[in-house]
Interface confidence: medium
């Protein structure tokens, strides 16, 4: 039978009026155009929601937005248009809410065509109040704030400039022409790129990259030659041409663009494109596409300075720069991601590593699924995990795979099981296990989200026709019961809960639609009742992650240590609570030659953990440099990986050797930098 | 108006193979799967497999893996059909039939699965030696 | 692969008549099922798509229901072009499976 249809499925109790009594509704007075919606700080309950409708004209467009606020999660709207003075927001901008627990939030105007700038409304009080502003500037980007000061604001206009306020938009002041890209970095400090001669298109491959760390005041030149700049973790990354051709490499800076080293990766042609997938205050895992329209490339981590770099997983599905890639960072268990692949029959296939990229695996079959069309043997297939490339495919996938950082080991996903992705309609799958082990959790294609840390999954079903109904799981998706929410039933839009997982309450999207009106409405749910009880001591089990072999004393290690959580019981129905904190308990494991990676000048040969020197340096397509000059290597051949923690057990010393290269390029070397003040 | 439109009537010796084309005009050759069904004389109808133009991917029914390929050309809106080692239970009518199987269509109300809506006039393909 | 059965081979009904075909399943295809009208010499017709909703021009006569596993396709009062086969064809779990077919003749 189908989850949750199982004789062994125990009901919550009296459900029906508990949920009743916490469903609330709110019809918005609108017109069905589009609408949005915001929450704005944590913990706080406040949601805006910008509805906007756009009325064709003979000669123009007439456009008309409304503004509402909640205080309650959702549970009641006030129409507050009034505060930003009935004005047209402009959509494509967004809603420009702060950093952390600010209240801050920006709306962007629609003005007219003659204006001397644009209009924005600022709040500084979680959107009680509004403040208009206009500004000297037609903006081109949403307003950017700092992450270390939200009085800090930045912005593109039409017209290239790059224009900063110092106190949350009240005074703007443009600090530079002719910007490209620009993006805040750590410390208030500002990366831009910028053009000499006509534009951002026509100098591609020829900006310069600049820095300011007082706001504007003062800038220093980091590089030349750009194609394009990039930000993760602490790592400043920037694509350079090469001096005799068009291709181009990465150089990566750890100090915000002093010194730069040239990344131990393939360059690319002007076809391709690197892209950085994710990225810590450890290491990176970049894409480097593969010459030609194959629509793949290969998946590159990087070691601690983000210079060498190890081959992580070949054909890694990435359609074209911007485009469509499937990989996930599994949020709810650490070291887990999940990516697809182009095989060579031009099928996709899903591929789970559960170390930062080390190893890459299919994802294991679910128990209780038997493999599809697309499987050679009916007993052997894995299953394979629908991600944005299925989204954009527009396959029946209405979600993205879902995971929390407090809802431990839970991962949700649309999937198929067989030999590749299916186009055929799919099913829900769950792991409790942060992608070890699957099982079919729901039929079909739904929404779905988490509550309360994981105690609670709520599910919609993804239907052609209106729906009334909502499914909600107590138990990590184990059984189900469905709620009527309503008598009539609406055309489903979305789900919105509160960002973290955390909240009890689901806003359920929708419009009404008659043979006049079509009207926005909300349903909210609260589910404090259902769980009538905080949880205590006996509601949660140890549970080690990463086991795969208890009989081994090693069991659980992944990066040199493995990790106990406190998990809520599957059988117990009570609230983990917003203050809810993961407890973890981390151990130590013994170092072994899997927990260092080969350093420059070194390989590993296959079927091989030791590390070899490699015979033949001169001449090597992966050279690169250190600090922007020329420099003696001094290695023993490994580096411990990005993150790992191992102490003792097997120590790879062996005699430090000199590796004297010389520097064949290095396009960001120092003395080609320079600095200059307003 | 939306059409698809097959080639004409084939016959084949057995071991030979057979393309058949199916041509869509009347909406976005993108937006929807194809897929291939066939008819035995006096018998049922029999699904051989799909495919999607956007990347070309495709999946077959176990009976034809290997033995069946599926294509298309977008520049053209047409979707090919190839059979080969062709036997004489392979004399059969074969049509392409417009297939959301899945597609979520534009607008709020088109999800799920919508059926084989359009068909084309279907393709006699006769094995004989 | 899901096996769709389809009950009785063969109806006669009577013109005016009321004809009930039936559709079971080998397993949930949950509301993915379509119903499929073919005469002698034509591609066949969509009729019925999501297990219950009308195709585009099709007559309120009609009508499909059923979900999970056991599906019925009702003509509420046959008209003479109604008489021909009719296939009922899951979407649920691929390869995408037809019934049998069930051949509705005049009485």
């Known amino acids: 039978s189908a989850p949750g249809e199982d004789e062994e499925c125990g009901r919550v109790r009296d459900f029906v009026a508990k949920l009743a009594n916490n469903t609330h509704q709110h019809v918005f007075d609108d017109l069905r155009g589009s609408v949005s919606l915001s929450w704005v700080g944590d913990s706080t309950g406040v949601i805006l929601v910008l509805t906007t409708f756009h009325v064709p004209l003979v000669i123009m467009t007439f456009g008309q937005s409304k503004l509402y606020r909640s205080e309650d999660y959702g549970k009641n709207f006030k129409d507050i248009t009034d505060l930003i003075n009935n004005t047209f927001i402009r959509t494509e901008f967004g809603m420009a809410i702060g950093p952390e627990n600010s209240g801050k939030v920006v709306l962007t105007a629609e003005v007219s065509g003659g204006s001397r700038g644009g209009r924005i409304f600022r709040s500084s009080d979680f959107a009680k109040n509004f403040v208009q502003t206009d500004l000297p500037f037609h903006p081109l980007t949403q307003m950017m704030y700092s992450p270390q000061n939200s009085d800090y604001l930045l912005a593109l206009s039409t017209e290239n400039g790059l224009w900063v306020s110092k106190n949350f938009g009240g005074k703007w002041e443009e600090i530079h022409k002719a910007v490209c890209l620009a993006k805040w970095g750590s410390d208030n400090t500002i990366f831009f790129t910028t053009y000499a001669n006509g534009s951002c298109k026509a100098d591609l491959g020829a900006l310069e990259l600049w820095r300011t760390s007082d706001l504007g005041k003062s800038f220093k030149t980091i590089g030349v030659k750009i194609y394009s700049f990039g930000l993760g973790g602490r790592f400043l990354f920037a694509s350079v041409m090469a001096d005799k051709d068009t291709t181009r490499r990465i150089h990566v800076s750890t100090d915000q663009g002093d010194t730069w080293s040239m990344a131990q990766l393939p360059s690319v042609g002007q076809e391709q494109f690197y892209s950085i997938l994710a990225a810590n205050d450890d290491m990176v895992f970049m894409h480097v596409d593969e010459p030609g329209d194959t629509g793949f490339g290969t998946i590159f981590t990087s070691d601690d300075r983000g210079i060498v770099y190890s081959k992580s997983l070949d054909r890694h599905l990435y359609t074209t720069t911007g485009g469509e890639t499937d990989f996930t960072n599994v949020t709810s268990l650490r070291g887990v991601y999940i990516t697809s692949v182009l095989s060579e029959d031009n099928s996709i296939q899903t591929m789970i590593t559960f170390d930062q990229g080390g190893r890459w695996t299919h994802l294991r079959k679910p128990e209780n699924s038997e493999c599809d069309a697309t499987a050679k043997n009916k007993n052997e297939c894995s299953l394979h995990i629908h991600a944005s490339y299925s989204i954009s495919q527009k396959l029946n996938v209405p979600m993205a795979p879902l995971s929390e950082p407090n809802a431990v080991g839970i991962v949700i996903a649309h999937g198929s099981v067989g030999d590749a992705i299916s186009v055929m309609v799919p099913d829900v799958y769950i792991s409790d296990d942060g992608g070890y082990s699957w099982t079919k959790m729901l039929e079909g294609p739904h929404y779905y989200t988490i509550l309360d840390s994981g105690g609670i999954i709520v599910a919609i079903e993804h239907s052609s026709r209106p729906i009334n109904v909502i499914k909600f799981s107590t138990d990590e998706g184990q059984c189900w019961q469905t709620y009527t929410f309503t008598r009539d039933p609406i055309y489903f839009t979305g789900l919105a809960s509160e960002p973290g997982a955390r909240s009890m309450n689901i806003s359920i999207w929708g419009f009404t639609e008659s043979f006049l009106t079509s009207q926005w409405v909300s349903y909210t749910i609260d589910f404090k009742d259902i769980l009538e009880r905080n949880c205590e001591e006996k509601d949660y089990t140890i549970w080690l992650a990463h086991s795969t072999d208890p009989e081994d004393y090693e069991d659980g290690c992944i990066l040199g240590y493995k990790e106990q959580f406190l998990r809520l019981r599957k059988s117990s129905v009570c609230q983990n609570g917003r203050d809810y904190v993961v407890t973890k308990q981390p151990s130590i494991c013994l170092c072994s030659l899997e927990d260092f990676l080969c350093d420059f000048g070194y390989y590993r040969p296959e079927n091989d953990s030791k590390c070899v020197e490699q015979p033949e340096l001169k001449g090597h397509d992966l050279e690169f440099c250190l600090y922007g000059r020329e420099e003696h290597l001094t290695t023993n051949g490994y580096r411990k990986i990005p993150g790992d923690k191992c102490q003792g057990g097997v120590n790879p010393v062996r005699e430090v050797k000199d590796l004297k290269k010389k520097c064949t390029s290095n396009f960001l070397s120092p003395e080609k930098q320079n600095s200059k003040s307003n | 108006q939306v059409q698809l439109v097959q080639s004409g009537a084939e016959v084949k010796k057995p071991g030979a193979s057979v393309k058949v084309s199916c041509k869509a005009s009347?909406?976005?050759?993108?937006?929807?799967?194809m897929s291939w069904v066939r008819q035995a004389p006096g018998q049922g109808l029999e699904w051989m497999g799909i495919?999607?133009?956007?990347?070309?991917?495709?999946s077959y029914a176990q009976k034809f893996q290997g033995r069946v390929t599926m294509t298309r050309d977008t520049s053209t809106s047409t979707v090919y059909m190839e059979l080969s080692s062709l036997r004489s239970e392979d004399t059969a009518v074969y049509y392409c039939?417009?297939?959301?199987?899945?597609?979520?269509?534009?607008?709020?109300?088109?999800?799920?699965?919508?059926?084989?809506?359009?068909w084309g006039q279907g393709t006699t393909v006769t094995v004989s030696s | 692969e899901i096996v769709m059965t389809q009950s009785p081979a063969t109806l006669s009904v009577s013109p005016g008549e009321r004809a009930t075909l039936s559709c079971r399943a080998s397993?949930?295809?949950?509301?993915?099922l379509a119903w499929y009208q073919q005469k002698p010499g034509q591609a066949p017709r969509l009729l019925i798509y999501g297990a219950s909703t009308r195709a585009t021009g099709i007559p309120a006569r009609f009508s499909g229901s059923g979900s999970g596993t056991e599906f019925t396709l009702t003509i509420s009062s046959l008209q003479s072009e109604d008489f021909a086969v009719y296939y009922c064809?899951?979407?649920?779990?691929?390869?995408?499976?037809f019934g049998g077919g069930t051949k509705v003749e005049i009485k």
């Open positions: 064809q899951q979407a649920r779990l691929g390869p995408w499976t």
């Open positions: 397993q949930s295809v949950s509301s993915n």
């Open positions: 039939a417009r297939d959301p199987s899945g597609i979520a269509l534009a607008g709020p109300a088109s999800r799920g699965y919508y059926g084989m809506d359009v």
């Open positions: 495919i999607n133009p956007v990347g070309g991917s495709t």
């Open positions: 009347g909406y976005t050759f993108t937006s929807r799967y």
